[in-house]
């Protein structure tokens, strides 16, 4: 039975040209995390393998950085980065847990940062 839950940064906003950290946390399970995939709509942004480390998609190499932890840092944000992001935790023996984050990239310099995992 899958008992775990994923806590995420939820709905967040950031300024165009800035950076943001996407963060998820899996709790309430003793399952072993084997890999975490970060996806944006139909694109795979990055993979963090528990044994092997990080690989960033070749199409996002310039704008995505691994970490902190199992999180992902998006840089040089554009309004086209607005949308849903998913952290997909592959675990053993539980299976797959998915967390959702909605990012809004604002033109204005008054983007609000409300989530506790976010860059201040």
């Amino acid at each position: 039975m899958m008992t775990g839950t994923i806590e995420t940064t939820g709905n967040i906003s950031a300024e165009k040209g800035g950076s943001i950290i996407l963060q998820c946390h899996l709790s309430s399970t003793t399952a072993q995390v084997t890999q975490v995939n970060w996806e944006q709509q139909d694109q795979l942004l990055a993979i963090c393998n528990a044994d092997l480390g990080w690989h960033i998609s070749p199409s996002f190499k310039d704008r995505v950085a691994p970490g902190p932890g199992l999180g992902l840092t998006l840089q040089s944000l554009t309004v086209n980065d607005t949308g849903e992001y998913f952290c997909i935790y592959h675990t053993y023996p539980d299976g797959t847990y998915t967390g959702r984050i909605f990012l809004e990239v604002l033109e204005s310099s008054v983007a609000e940062h409300g989530a506790r995992f976010q860059i201040p």
Epitope: D42, Q43, L44, H55, P58
Partner: antibody, heavy 119, light 107 residues
Amino acid sequence: EVQLVESGGGLVQPGGSLRLSCAASGFTFSDYYMYWVRQAPGKGLEWVASITKGGGSTYYPDTLKGRFTISRDNAKNSLYLQMNSLRAEDTAVYYCARQSSYDFVMDYWGQGTTVTVSS
Amino acid sequence: DIQMTQSPSSLSASVGDRVTITCKASQDVDTAVAWYQQKPGKAPKLLIYWASARHTGVPSRFSGSGSGTDFTFTISSLQPEDIATYYCQQYSNYPLTFGQGTKLEIK
């Protein structure tokens, strides 16, 4: 069992067009990035195109941009490569391949379909 | 573009021999390197990904190592069925690029 079966190859004249297809089975097609890779006779492997899971983004080497178009139909479990303005140097075996779920790497390949561009 | 320079281009070895192929990237590709085996008239098969991880079902005599720009592929004890051409590939950056291949023959 993962299966990828290419079709649509053949003999075409320079300047002509051809559409290759790849029928996928044995896995949830819509969950995977897909690729086309080609191999000219007696030569090495050359990446041709990539497409994301839903088909929203496509990638090509600069040398092929504008002439080749990768697409997919997830309802039909099919991948396509539209090739226009074909040249003699496009003569090759064309393979479709699936991206691994563990990494950005091609883990399963079809048997290939042969394209010959000649007058 | 990242060039993958593979060496040697061909080699002849005896059954039971340890065989080593090297691949040098023209710039840092971290560990985003795969190795494929291609037998005549057949499609390539993935052997190694993430520079050193064996793909499902690949025998333990095949191994890979390296990071950055220098990578090595090893067959610890050559078997007759290993006769093939082997390719390295980097997938760190677009365009994805392959080495020119190493044709392995039995002495």
